[in-house]
């Protein structure tokens, strides 16, 4: 004969454990039901009655089967430099990620604590490593035969055009200027195209290294040449 199915609450076998989606209540000394995601324990079980669950209130959640007396509070609204990629529901917390053109400089368990604007490489420098959601752009000086004349978080060093007759030689920050005959493009070293960064469609200009606090900075940063712009904390 099959073993009799025990209904919660029930006393476990000596040395035994409770089943999936059950927990052992120390006070009642019984195996009791957990509450499903989106709910919490309104009334704990006794020897004769099972756990009473209730739905989470607005702006609170539980993500796992649980027996917590209160649901967890959802995180505060996403800051201006972030976008909400997961809304606050009864079953999940809000997740904020950095908006395009920014990256997460300091992460937290879910989402981002501090967003910062992706570095823009100045003329003479090109992108050596594109930015990602969690890492900044890495710039490098343009090697001989290549140039970058932009301030950009995506542009790489490009090869100088090859002229039949050079009017002005190119350098790291300027392309060669040819006389009227049509130029061709060289395949200079270091001119290989990099994949586009994950998130760099920024409408926000990288603050120039000027002697003032960077705009869009919600930290109390010192006055002085302060290149990176940081967003507010996303807690």
């Amino acid at each position: 004969l099959p073993a009799q199915v025990a209904f919660t609450p029930y006393a476990p076998e000596p040395g035994g454990t409770c089943r999936l989606r059950e927990y052992y209540d120390q006070t009642a000394q019984m195996c009791c039901s957990k509450c499903p995601p989106g709910q919490h324990a309104k009334v704990f079980c006794t020897k004769t009655s099972d756990t009473v669950c209730d739905s989470c209130e607005d702006s609170t959640y539980t993500q796992l089967w649980n027996w917590v007396p209160e649901c967890l509070s959802c995180g505060s609204r996403c800051s201006s430099d972030q976008v909400e990629t997961q809304a606050c529901t009864r079953e999940q917390n809000r997740i904020c990620t950095c908006r395009p053109g920014w990256y997460c400089a300091l992460s937290k368990q879910e989402g981002c604590r501090l967003c910062a604007q992706l570095r823009k490489c100045r003329p003479g420098f090109g992108v050596a490593r594109p930015g990602t959601e969690t890492s900044d752009v890495v710039c490098k000086p343009c090697a001989p035969g290549t140039f970058s004349n932009t301030t950009s978080s995506t542009d790489i060093c490009r090869p100088h055009q090859i002229c039949h007759v050079v009017a002005i030689p190119g350098n790291a920050s300027m392309d060669a200027v040819c006389t009227s005959t049509s130029p061709t493009r060289s395949m200079a070293p270091g001119a290989v195209h990099l994949p586009q960064p994950v998130s760099t469609r920024s409408q926000h200009t990288q603050p120039t290294p000027a002697p003032s606090t960077a705009p869009g900075t919600s930290f109390l940063l010192p006055v002085g040449p302060s290149p990176p712009a940081e967003g507010s904390t996303g807690d």
């Epitope: 501090l114 910062a116 930290f219 010192p222 040449p225």
Partner: antibody, heavy 121, light 107 residues
Framework: EVQLVESGGGLVQPGGSLRLSCAAS????????LSWVRQAPGKGLEWVAY????????YYSDTVKGRFTISRDNAKNTLYLQMNSLRAEDTAVYYC??????????????WGQGTLVTVSS | DIQMTQSPSSLSASVGDRVTITCRTS??????LPWYQQKPGKSPKLLVY???KLAEGVPSRFSGSGSGTDYTLTISSLQPEDFATYYC?????????FGQGTKVEIK
């Protein structure tokens, strides 16, 4: 107020090791690139090592490459310099500096007070 | 490596004098050049960056000029607090070398 406070300097024998630390405050540490610069007694300044804000990119001067390692802990707002196989010529005041924001803002804008490393038998 | 030639290595001047320090690089560094001031027993301080831009809080008697391989730091009217050692530095390809320094002394 930006503050960079070095520690860990001292007297060490040739061939020995030392780990310098730099505790930073007053700015969003994880968004800034950092470097170590040293100055031998009565001499000029020498750049030693650089690390970018995420710790992905590191550069070293030829004189320390393979012996020194720069690292950072963004959760602790701390920069490190692990110095191995020390030589007499490594004797210097070591400065923790903020910058350069390489490729974008190329300068050292804040300097620590320095910590003295003496390599002698 | 890019060589930095700073001159003079030292100079004697009086309060009110105009002082010029030069820095020459072995190849173009595209104005990626800061100047620092260091007083005895103190840490260096940023004066000028990008060859010509004055750092925050630096008096306007300091100015930077130059491009390509030739750069100049000028103090238009030397003040008592300006007696110090001055360093140029490049931020082009690594290693990022400093000039040898110019010690400005009281005449």
């Amino acid at each position: 107020e930006v503050q960079l406070v070095e520690s860990g300097g001292g007297l060490v024998q040739p061939g020995g090791s030392l780990r310098l630390s730099c505790a930073a405050s007053g700015f969003a540490f994880s968004t800034y690139d950092l470097s170590w610069v040293r100055q031998a007694p009565g001499k000029g300044l020498e750049w030693v090592a650089y690390i970018n804000n995420g710790g992905i990119s590191t550069y070293y001067s030829d004189t320390v490459k393979g012996r020194f390692t720069i690292s950072r802990d963004n959760a602790k707002n701390t920069l490190y310099l692990q110095m191995n196989s020390l030589r007499a010529e490594d004797t210097a005041v070591y400065y923790c500096v903020r910058g350069p924001f390489y490729g974008s803002a190329n300068y050292f804008d804040y300097w620590g007070q320095g910590t003295l490393v003496t390599v002698s038998s | 490596d890019i060589q930095m030639t700073q001159s003079p290595s030292s100079l004697s001047a009086s309060v009110g004098d105009r002082v010029t320090i030069t820095c020459r690089t072995s190849e173009s560094i595209y104005s990626n050049l800061p100047w620092y001031q260091q007083k005895p027993g103190k840490s260096p301080k940023l004066l000028v960056y990008d060859a010509t831009k004055l750092a925050e809080g630096v008096p306007s008697r300091f100015s930077g000029s130059g491009s390509g391989t030739d750069y100049t730091l000028t103090i238009s009217s030397l003040q008592p607090e300006d007696f110090a050692t001055y360093y140029c530095q490049h931020f082009w390809v690594t290693p990022w070398t400093f000039g040898q320094g110019t010690k400005v002394e009281i005449k």
